[in-house]
């Protein structure tokens, strides 16, 4: 039943031989390899005109390999295909082609595009980030006493990066300006100049921004009429809501 | 579009013979080693047997070697599976497949059924 | 021959569930391993070959993955058309062997 390709080749060259080399197990002067010895793969090259039978170890570039009982054999893949499963089903082109669900193509389908990398189609992949973290406290110079206007922070992560033709990724960090009501540093947080500026004396600025709240205790003192005390309570509630409103508007992002 | 169809199951006595086919269509017949494949009732796939793409070599399962004859026409995309001998445990759907590593194309399946 | 061992014989899954199925080979078949999917009365149709790449039209929910002995196939979302027998064949060399089979139901 298993009438086998090599037998009926021998028959028609009278001329074979045992004493083979490079693997074949029994060979032709004209035909080369007609049968491989047990683990090598036979493929038959074409030279020319003639087809020459070769034992390897593995099939070359642009074949794949059969394990028959009795034969160990490559066949060739299709044109545009360096390695294949088999006819129908290429798993690496060759060089100008793109891989796509097993065939070789030249450019890649509408929706998809060329990984140059692996030379396979592959699907758009967009950015994607996560939700913002909650704003930073209000900061200056990495404090967050000992002034009136600093900026507060806000991040996020990217949970996916975007492939060439992806949609870009958003801003990972924003940056806003915030206006609080100054604080004095306690002993801990102020540093050596900071003490010596403050026994020095309070510039004007200074001066102009303190207020009887209970944040600037002690740094002023006068007495107030009720009339002027009023005036003064109107111009904190002004200033406040002035103050909320930049929060709201003031928005600077940053893209890392 | 491919096509594997097959024909000729039914119904016969144990030690009797049937004789199932397989007209190919919208592929190179003649390229495709090709493969009987069979599914016993509720039960898994098992290869049955395979013919070379140019007829010269078959290969067989040993339960059903010297029983089943495995044969091709190229000019006429056909697939022939002579079974002789049949025993109970032959009872299948046989389905007639392209066998080239894997079972690219497959047909809709032929019922043959061995009872006494 | 090369023994196919595939399991579990049979589950059921939930819409949207993750399942896997496995089969171990008897000896190294590097990554010469099939999947097919066999609905309810119809012939298998191939699902994936070279052990991870997918046949054309098949929905990227199902993946494969393995080499050497041990082989799976993983469905990212069952899907009420999932519902099927699964094989694993090896192709690494003749005879031909198919695993046992999986029937995945659904839940």
């Known amino acids: 039943q298993n009438a086998s390709r090599g037998r009926r080749q021998r028959r028609m060259h009278p001329n074979v031989s045992q004493g083979c080399q490079g693997g074949c197990a029994t060979c032709s002067d004209y035909n080369g390899c007609l049968s491989c010895k047990p683990r090598l793969f036979f493929v038959l090259e074409r030279i020319g005109m003639k087809q020459i039978g070769v034992c390897l170890s593995s099939c070359p570039s642009g074949y794949y390999g059969t394990r028959y009982p009795d034969i160990n054999k490559c066949t060739k893949c299709k044109v545009d295909c360096d390695t294949c499963f088999n006819k129908n089903f290429c798993t690496k082109c060759k060089s100008g082609f793109y891989l796509h669900l097993g065939k070789c193509l030249d450019s890649c389908p509408e929706g998809l595009e060329a990984n140059n990398h692996t030379m396979e189609c592959v699907s758009i992949v967009h950015c994607e980030a996560s939700e913002w973290s909650p704003w930073s406290p209000c900061m200056k110079k990495g404090k967050t006493c000992g002034f009136k206007r600093g900026t507060e922070t806000r991040v996020r992560d990217i949970l996916q990066h975007p492939s060439a033709k992806g949609n870009l990724c958003p801003p990972t960090s924003e940056t806003r300006t915030c206006i609080v009501q100054r604080k004095k540093c306690s002993k801990g947080e102020r540093g050596k100049k900071g003490r010596e500026r403050k026994r020095k004396k309070l510039n004007k600025e200074e001066r102009k921004e303190t207020s009887s709240s209970s944040d600037s205790k002690g740094l002023e003192s006068s007495i107030e009429t009720p009339d002027q005390q009023e005036n003064k309570e109107r111009q904190q509630q002004q200033k406040r809501r002035a103050r909320d409103k930049q929060q709201k508007s003031v928005s600077v992002s940053t893209v890392h | 579009e491919v096509q594997l169809v097959e024909s000729g199951g039914g119904s016969v006595q144990p030690g009797r013979s049937l004789k199932v086919s397989c007209a190919a269509s919208?592929?190179?017949?003649?390229?495709?080693?090709m493969a009987w494949v069979r599914q016993a009732p509720k039960k898994g796939l098992e290869w049955v047997a395979t013919?070379?793409?140019?007829?010269?070599?078959?290969y067989y399962r040993d339960s059903v070697k010297g029983r089943f004859t495995l044969s091709r026409d190229n000019t006429k995309s056909t697939l022939c599976l002579q079974m002789d001998s049949l025993r109970s445990e032959d009872t299948a759907t046989y389905y007639c497949?392209?066998?080239?590593?894997?079972?690219?194309?497959w047909g809709q399946g032929i019922m043959v059924t061995v009872s006494s | 021959d090369i023994q196919m061992t595939q399991s579990p014989a049979s589950l059921s899954a939930s819409l949207g569930e993750t399942v896997s199925i496995e089969c171990l080979a008897s000896?190294?078949?590097?990554?010469?391993l099939v999947w097919y999917q066999q609905k309810s009365g119809k012939s298998p149709q191939l699902l994936i070959y070279a052990a991870s790449r997918l046949q054309d039209g098949v929905p990227s929910r199902f993946s494969g993955s393995g080499f050497g002995t041990r082989f799976s196939l993983k469905i990212s979302g069952m899907q009420p058309e999932d519902e099927a027998d699964y094989f694993c064949?090896?192709?690494?060399?003749?005879?031909?062997?198919f695993g046992a089979g999986t029937k995945l139901g659904l839940k």
């Open positions: 497949a392209a066998h080239d590593r894997s079972f690219d194309y």
């Open positions: 064949q090896q192709s690494y060399k003749y005879l031909p062997t």
């Open positions: 000896e190294d078949i590097s990554n010469d």
């Open positions: 013919i070379i793409y140019d007829g010269s070599r078959t």
């Open positions: 919208g592929f190179t017949f003649s390229d495709y080693d």
